[in-house]
């Protein structure tokens, strides 16, 4: 008896797919063996077609995969466009030979049934529409005409020329012909269910005279697509169900045992646990749309549907698409936080993880928004103008080669609360979804600039300082000057290393900036920081507006605004002449031309590359003091 | 209201053979998977055999006790489900249960991955 365990007996018809899952005991080691499919040979050698070390055999090129499943303890095979080839003996696995645990599995692969000549077979989808056609002989042109449907050995009129249908056919079936023509008659059957399948017979006339023909009708279950998606990432179902639907209401549900139960739709119903993380997108006006799904979790394995009706819902005899979703938990994405908390006024970094072999891609954050179908206009990326009511408080720092990039967002409000999503260009499976929090504030925040009412004036010395407390110690502090591109820090060389104090003077823990002499261009927003390495923490904003000297206004000493430095040991100071070159980049729509639901960040192209990369000064000059 | 009904049960000598037969009136869907399962008095109920469908493929299962011996067939459209029971053994004797769920999801050993249940069927197998 083997411990390996899956369909001993597998059938299907030619053109088909099928998808084989195989069990095994849930041990550590079956867990990362070896995993394999091999087709059984005469002379008792199985020869292996596809396995987990990645083979795959030439005759299984393009329509196989073997995917584990370690947290179910189970592997799945699939195998599309079959043909009669493929039936045969085959074994599912475990080890490094093909002698190891195994399964046996049969699998037979039949041609499509044929039928007598004089049946028609009209293969259909659930929810579709039939056009069945009748011939005659142009002496029943004028006779009755009727559709019915076998049952045993008596045929139930479904309808007829008379204008009766059927009850169960009310709404559903009518008999037409077409122009001129007068040897044929045509039933359509709408909104097919699956008790509508079986043999038909049409017919013109009555008794030995009637001119009769066969119809075979097969309506199908959708057959699932299988998704196979990783943990963390992302999932988008494309739906397309016709013309005949492009009006109707459309929805996502998932299958929960009898129901299905509606996750989205477009008159605006929304499944909580899909809260911040979906987006429904009408691609034409066709009926078309798509469902996206980001941060996927293992709960949202399972089957899913989507289908038009005027209510939203799921109603038979309507078309539909499914699919089954498998969440593999050995995910390549990392584990970031899903939510982050702020006060009001304060700030907060947000890690971003991308693909790391994808470092040159476009980064950007957006903001979902529940309103209608969803959607998440960008607010910030690496060539996208900072969207409007963010200019000054937030920031896309780039970190090439790390996998990561963090959004800074300061000045938090009550109304920043909500769900934002991470995304690139590159790779789709790495989105994420974060949901920030944003409270009010109870006490006075970590970093603290002053003067609070910050203007300079051309041509003089213009400092400003921010109080950090004991605990940012340790940690880098930084002033950056904001702008549509980012926030670019201002360039600085430490004097020899700071001696370390063992006691911390809480007033006394200062970092400034000094604008020596202060020129036009240096009006705009700053920002104070912390970071640890490529790790960045807590920041404040400060506007500094510049203005001309009048006649009466006091004129500052250069080395009184700086005496401070000089007193405070604590303190660093950064002088600069800032020159900034405000490189204003936007979100190329074409980036997005499958994924229409990320919104356009603003409206001018921009051809050089803005860069948003922590350290890099722009063309600005200073020193420390 | 759902209802799985089974029949085709009765005594019958060691070597004989037995077909049972199970129909599904009721259920919201064409059953993607049904099986069959027997309880002997004072035992667990343990899998027998099974049927799933995936569009116009289908896929069974069988427990390693009944293979070569059992042949489990359906309908999914109909909603019907069979068991051809051939060499029987006095250790068959259990009451049999039909049992039906919306997905070919899950292992379909396991008796919590079945949504419906039949009222059960008596098989004895004694000389």
């Known amino acids: 008896q083997s411990p390996i365990f899956g369909p001993q007996d597998v059938s299907s018809i030619e053109g088909n797919s099928v998808s084989i899952t195989c069990y095994y005991p849930d041990t550590s080691v079956n867990r990362h063996t070896r995993k394999y499919w091999c087709r059984q040979g005469a002379n008792g050698y199985c020869a292996t077609l596809i396995s987990s070390n990645g083979y795959l055999s030439k005759e299984y090129s393009g329509r196989a995969s073997l995917i584990n499943f370690p947290e179910n303890s189970t592997f799945v095979i699939n195998i599309a466009h079959l043909t009669q080839e493929d039936t045969g003996s085959y074994k599912c696995g475990l080890g490094t030979t093909n002698r190891g645990l195994f399964f046996d599995v049969s699998l037979e692969v039949s041609q499509v049934p044929e039928f007598p000549n004089d049946t028609h077979v009209y293969t259909k989808d659930i929810g579709r529409t039939v056009t069945i056609e009748c011939r005659f002989k142009e002496g029943n042109a004028h006779s009755k005409k009727s559709l019915c449907k076998k049952r045993g050995e008596a045929c139930e009129v479904v309808i007829d020329s008379t204008e009766y249908v059927d009850p169960s056919y009310k709404d559903r079936a009518i008999l037409f012909m077409k122009g001129t023509s007068r040897d044929i008659f045509y039933v359509n059957i709408s909104h097919l269910i699956p008790s509508d399948a079986g043999l038909y017979v049409c017919q013109a006339g009555e008794g030995p005279s009637a001119d009769k023909n066969n119809a075979d009708l097969q309506v199908l279950e959708p057959e699932p697509e299988l998704l196979y998606k990783d943990l963390r990432s992302s999932v988008t179902f494309e739906c397309d169900l016709g013309r005949e639907v492009a009006n109707d209401a459309k929805y996502l549900c998932r299958k929960n045992k009898e129901t299905c139960d509606v996750i989205i739709n477009t008159l605006g119903k929304r499944d909580p646990a899909f809260e911040g993380r979906i987006l429904l997108t009408p691609r034409d006006d066709n009926g078309r749309f798509s469902v996206l799904i980001t941060g996927l979790r293992k709960e949202d394995a399972g089957h899913y549907q989507c289908g038009a009706h005027s209510s939203g819902l799921p109603q038979e005899g309507w078309p539909v698409q499914a699919w089954q979703l498998f969440v593999n938990e050995e995910s390549t994405i990392p584990n970031s936080r899903s939510v982050v908390k702020g006060v009001t006024g304060g700030s907060v970094a947000i890690v971003c993880p991308y693909n790391p072999k994808e470092s040159s891609s476009l980064k950007y954050w957006c903001h979902w928004e529940a309103d209608e179908n969803g959607r998440c206009p960008v607010l910030v990326g690496t060539q996208a103008l900072v969207q409007e009511g963010y200019e000054g408080r937030l920031a896309l720092f780039d970190q090439p080669g790390s996998g990561a990039y963090t959004v800074i967002l300061n000045q938090l409000t009550t109304q920043d609360s909500g769900f934002y999503w991470c995304l690139t260009d590159g790779d789709s499976r790495w989105r994420t979804t974060i949901e920030l929090q944003v409270a009010e504030a109870t006490k006075k925040p970590d970093l603290e600039v002053t003067p609070q009412n910050a203007t300079a004036v051309i041509g003089e010395t213009f400092t400003i300082s921010c109080h950090y407390p004991c605990k940012f110690y340790s940690q880098e502090k930084y002033w950056c000057k904001w702008s549509n591109d980012g926030c670019h820090i201002l360039p600085s060389h430490d004097e020899g290393a700071r001696q370390s104090s063992v006691s911390c003077d809480q007033s006394s823990q200062i970092v400034s900036m000094t604008l020596n002499p202060v020129k036009k261009e240096d009006e705009g927003w700053y920002w104070c920081g912390v970071k640890e390495g490529q790790v960045y923490g807590e920041t404040t904003a400060i506007y500094v507006a510049v203005e001309e000297r009048t006649r009466g206004s006091p004129h500052i000493n250069p080395t009184d605004a700086n005496a401070r430095a000089k007193d405070a040991p604590e303190e660093e100071a950064m002088e600069s002449s800032v020159r900034e070159d405000e490189n204003k980049a936007n979100l190329d729509p074409r980036l997005f031309a499958d994924e229409r639901e990320i919104q356009n960040a603003g409206d001018q192209a921009q051809e050089n590359r803005a860069s948003g990369n922590a350290g890099s000064a722009g063309g600005q000059s200073g020193s420390s003091k | 209201q759902v209802q799985l009904v089974e029949s085709g049960g009765g005594l019958v000598q060691p070597g004989g053979s037995l077909r049972l037969s199970c129909v599904a009136s009721?259920?919201?869907?064409?059953?993607?998977?049904m099986a069959w399962f027997a309880q002997a008095p004072g035992k667990e109920r343990e899998f027998v055999a099974a049927?799933?469908?995936?569009?116009?493929?289908?896929?069974?299962y069988y427990a390693d006790s009944v293979k070569g011996r059992f042949t489990v067939s359906g309908d999914n459209a109909k909603k019907t489900l069979d068991l051809q029971m051939k060499d029987l053994k006095p250790e068959d004797t259990a009451l049999y249960f039909c049992?039906?769920?919306?997905?070919?999801?899950?292992?379909?050993?396991?008796?919590?991955?079945?949504?419906?249940w039949g009222q059960g069927t008596q098989v004895t197998v004694s000389s």
């Open positions: 009721g259920l919201p869907f064409s059953s993607s998977r």
């Open positions: 049927i799933g469908w995936r569009g116009r493929t289908s896929y069974k």
């Open positions: 049992a039906a769920h919306p997905n070919d999801d899950g292992d379909p050993r396991i008796s919590g991955n079945y949504q419906y």
